[in-house]
């Protein structure tokens, strides 16, 4: 029996009666939050042989092993994990060893056991036999390996019946507990299974199978499993379900969820039955199983139940993420926060119509409204009292509205109103009239003359860049030096540059007036000498990379209508020279025959330009005699060679902190002081450590139903 | 021919236990999610459960935690195990098919009358 | 959950006729309502699926309108065996649920 989607069992032990015919999970099995110790012996679930997600224990009292409880769970296939990991056994107090005898395959995902404090035969599992990689293994804060005393079957009685391979140097038995070994099958067989006779399984079983090189006594399948058989891809008509078997267009129409609407089911796509279409596609209407690919972003409605949408702070934001269409009003009152604009956008750059109106006021964090990037219409459907469908007052540092090279917006109905922006030019408001089809619509007082731009310098003259210089980490500019009608009145000149792959960047680009600015930013006085052209060296830069620059003149000059006389140069774009790029990652060698080497390795983290070629060097090295040293025709041990890893044992350190030789002389020496490398690492660990326990903490910890 | 037969009503006593069973055939039954609908004697038709074809399973308040809905896909067969039953649980029981948006063919099974009575 | 609500109670219709019947969702469902028609000692029978959706073998004097929270059903001409109970069921989200039923009966 399949059983899912997904299992969760807690705080009363009998309800893993559950599990009784399942033979497949379709989904996780959580087993959590027992906290009364319960005697298992009884339960025990011989038919559960796969689990397609992951498989989570978290303080379990009473359970010292899972072996009899899953005798039989051959392969966890962890199509979702839970953070990364397929199986995660946490807290568990009592638990003296893992004991799933039968696990031979983790299919994607790693491991992490932690905080176990009675848990062994955790170094006698060769995890390599069951994952692909071990190197994202977490398992730490458990029993002491030194306090476990972990024998293997048959080792006291001198007749050992485990297999032998090598973890981190050290050649050993492997098992699971003191009568149970870690099956491992013949190297005949190489990545196929086994029967527990070791007869070599079909290529298409997985973990192992019931009689051998028979695709319909697999125990689990490597790719699909379809109407009993494992099969590498699903026939025709039928569709991939949950990474692991092949369901027909009715099953997967039949799939129901308390969350979404009937017409909201599961959609065929790319050959999958799946709970929703993919990004960049959408159902193919309201009645449709099928997807087609969006024009531009997916479009998603988002409506306000009480009409009017205040955007005060990014987690009000947070609710329009993905949203492409509001149908309701947006009222947005940012008056501070951190990284203020470009959080915006993150949350509401993709809204492109407003069916109501956008009234934008008392919001003193913004500096434009760019991060409405792809806003093109206001439909205006309800408007504010006078007839308002974009309502801008009172916003003490807004400078631009959009950039209107670049930008298309249409506001259908309603009048536009200006006020008390001190530092929004009226060019930019005449402009956006033009733009949006609504000159003619305000009245006089609808734009205020006096109040917008009275502190900006709206009347802008261009600066001219004279020359550019680049090296592989400098660029050197200069420009003309501007000449304002009183020459004291000009005080500097501030550069901005940023790196910028693509030539898109404007001024206002994730700028707010709460100090978050994308830019970097550089203050350049006047050149003492009048005839000298004003210029700057910008030094630490990378190489191979291309900047966008631009330098605003910083002015005191009033002119008509008390308003400022300003320069500022258009965004030059520039490119540092090439340099050497770093070294290549990864380099493996490999013999393949008797004269040949294969190396391999990926490309240089910082190329620093256009890669061309790669230079290989080799040398002849001696021959290393300690190959010779031993009879390899004898039947003796082979000797395993031990290598230093550059690891230190901290317990043993601890124990006996005076017993190293410190430089030429003998006496007693503390343990050397931790690098700055080693600090962070351990900072860095503690932290991870942290966002885990969080993260398991905020998904299992649910409030009662009601 | 696509039908539905049920079996399994009968008289039981309040607190008491029942099992119904409803016998699918004429298609193919792991494709499709099974509801049972009930109406008591002289009323309206009332939902109380469903199983998908994952085996996902959602219930009425009314009887959430007293029955069970399952189904055996190898025996092409639908269940629902009735317990703690009550007076108010009297009623013709269906088994029904419902179909969806993009294959929505209706089959009932004949109705099987359960009665709840001391 | 959605509840439905059907009206009116009951429909005094003569033959030949025509009849409307209405069912009102207390949130919106979208087109996911049924109409079944049921006489005594039977099961139900499907109608109308999806709100406007008609099914073969159906008499097309039967049709059904509506989106939202509001949906109607008509029945043309009414035949002798037209009279009968109607119930509305949503299966827009879940627990499903049903009307109370309108009875149309002979005038």
């Known amino acids: 029996e399949i059983c899912g989607p997904g299992i969760d069992i807690r705080n009363d032990y009998q309800q893993l009666k559950r599990l009784e015919n399942c033979t497949v999970i379709e989904g996780y099995l959580h087993i959590l939050l027992i906290s009364k110790a319960e005697d298992y012996r009884s339960y025990r679930f011989p038919k559960l042989t796969v689990i397609t997600e992951y498989l989570l224990l978290f303080r379990v009292a009473g359970l010292e092993s899972l072996g009899d409880l899953f005798p039989n769970l051959t392969v966890i296939r962890g199509w979702k994990l839970f953070y990364n990991y397929a199986l995660v056994i946490f807290e568990m107090t009592n638990l003296k060893d893992i004991g799933l005898y039968n696990l031979r395959n983790i299919t994607r995902g790693a491991i992490r056991i932690e905080k176990n404090a009675d848990l062994c035969y955790l170094s006698t599992v060769d995890w390599s036999l069951i994952l692909d990689a071990v190197s994202n293994n977490y398992i730490v804060g458990n029993k002491p390996p030194k306090e476990c005393g972990d024998l293997c079957p048959g080792t006291m009685e001198e007749k050992p019946m485990c297999e032998k391979t090598t973890i981190n140097n050290e050649y050993n038995y492997r098992c699971w507990t003191t009568n149970r070994c870690q099956k491992m099958c013949p190297s005949t067989c190489g990545k196929r299974a086994c029967t527990e006779n070791n007869e070599c399984c079909h290529p298409e079983c997985l973990g192992s199978c019931s009689a051998p090189d028979n695709d319909t006594a697999c125990v689990a399948c490597r790719h699909y499993y379809y109407a009993g058989v494992c099969v590498p891809a699903c026939p025709p008509n039928t569709y991939r379900f949950e990474g692991w078997r092949c369901v027909d267009r009715d099953f997967c129409a039949n799939i129901l969820s308390a969350e979404s609407s009937d017409s909201e089911g599961f959609v065929i796509h790319d050959g999958e039955c799946m709970q929703e279409c993919p990004s960049g596609f959408i159902r193919n209407g309201s009645q449709s199983m099928y997807c087609i690919p969006c024009e531009g972003p997916c479009p998603k409605v988002c409506e306000e139940e009480k009409k009017t949408k205040t955007i005060d702070s990014v987690t009000s934001a947070q609710m329009l993420q993905g949203c492409t269409i509001f149908k309701g009003n947006l009222l947005i009152n940012i008056r501070r926060g951190n990284n203020i604009a470009s959080e915006l956008e993150n949350f509401m750059g993709l809204i492109e119509v407003v069916t109501g109106y956008v009234k934008i006021r008392h919001s003193h964090a913004l500096v434009s409204l760019s991060f409405l990037k792809n806003l093109r219409l206001i439909l205006g459907e309800e408007q504010l009292e006078g007839n308002y469908s974009f309502y801008v007052l009172d916003n003490q540092n807004l400078q631009q509205l959009w950039d209107w090279d670049h930008r298309n917006l249409t506001i259908k109905a309603g009048k536009m109103y200006f006020a008390f922006n001190p530092k929004l030019c009226v060019s930019e408001i005449y402009r956006m009239e033009e733009v949006t089809g609504t000159k003619g619509r305000q009245s006089k007082g609808d734009i205020n003359t006096r109040n917008n731009g009275e502190r900006a310098s709206c009347e802008s003259d261009v600066l001219h860049f004279t020359s550019t210089t680049t090296s592989k980490n400098r660029i050197i500019i200069t420009w003309h030096r501007y000449r304002p009608p009183d020459y004291r009145d000009l005080i500097s000149f501030t550069v901005y540059y940023k790196e910028a792959p693509f030539k898109n960047v404007t001024e206002y680009d994730g700028q707010d007036a709460c100090g978050s600015n994308s830019w970097n930013m550089v203050d350049v006085d006047l050149p003492p000498n009048k005839d000298v052209e004003p210029g700057i060296l910008l030094h630490g830069l990378k190489p191979w990379t291309q900047y966008a620059v631009y330098v605003k003149a910083v002015t005191l000059t009033m002119v008509e209508n008390d308003h400022i006389r300003g320069a500022k140069s258009e965004i030059l774009y520039i490119r540092t020279n090439a340099s050497v790029p770093s070294i290549p990652l990864d380099v493996l060698s490999a013999s393949n025959s008797s004269s040949q080497l294969i190396v391999k390795w990926n490309p240089p983290s910082l190329p620093n330009g256009n890669l061309s070629y790669y230079i290989v060097r080799w040398q002849r090295q001696p021959q290393d005699g300690y190959l010779y040293r031993h009879n390899y025709c004898s039947k003796d041990k082979i000797p395993i060679r031990k290598y230093a890893d550059g690891t230190i044992d901290i317990e043993e350190v601890t124990e006996n902190p005076k017993t190293e030789v410190c430089g030429g002389e003998k006496g007693p020496c503390c343990a050397c002081p931790k690098t700055e490398a080693e600090k962070q690492a351990e900072k860095e660990e503690a932290e991870y450590r942290k966002v885990f326990e969080n993260f398991l903490h905020n998904s299992i910890f649910v409030p009662r139903p009601e | 021919e696509v039908q539905l037969v049920q079996s399994g009503g009968g008289l039981v006593k309040p607190g008491g236990s029942l099992r119904l069973s409803c016998a699918a055939s004429?298609?193919?039954?792991?494709?499709?999610?099974m509801h049972w609908v009930r109406q008591a004697p002289g009323k309206g038709l009332e939902w109380i459960s469903v199983?998908?074809?994952?085996?996902?399973?959602y219930y009425a308040d009314s009887v959430k935690g007293r029955f069970t809905i399952s189904r055996d896909n190898a025996k092409n067969s639908l269940y629902l195990q009735m317990n703690s039953l009550r007076a108010e649980d009297t009623a013709v029981y269906y088994c029904?098919?419902?179909?969806?948006?993009?294959?929505?063919?209706?089959?009932w099974g004949q109705g099987t009358t359960v009665t709840v009575s001391s | 959950e959605i509840v439905l609500t059907q009206s009116p109670g009951t429909l005094s219709v003569s033959p030949g006729e025509r009849a409307t019947l209405s069912c009102r969702a207390s949130?919106?469902?979208?087109?996911?309502l049924h109409w079944y028609q049921q006489k005594p000692g039977q099961a139900p029978r499907l109608l109308i699926k999806?709100?406007?959706q008609s099914l073969s073998g159906i008499p097309d004097r039967f049709s059904g309108s509506g989106s939202g929270t509001d949906f109607t059903l008509t029945i043309s001409r009414l035949e002798p065996e037209d009279f009968a109970v109607y119930y509305c069921?949503?299966?827009?989200?879940?627990?499903?649920?049903f009307g109370q039923g309108t009875k149309v009966e002979i005038k």
């Open positions: 029904h098919r419902l179909g969806n948006f993009y294959y929505h063919m209706d089959v």
């Open positions: 004429g298609f193919t039954f792991s494709s499709f999610a």
């Open positions: 199983i998908d074809t994952r085996g996902a399973t």
């Open positions: 949130q919106s469902i979208g087109s996911s």
């Open positions: 999806y709100a406007s």
């Open positions: 069921h949503q299966s827009s989200r879940l627990p499903h649920t």
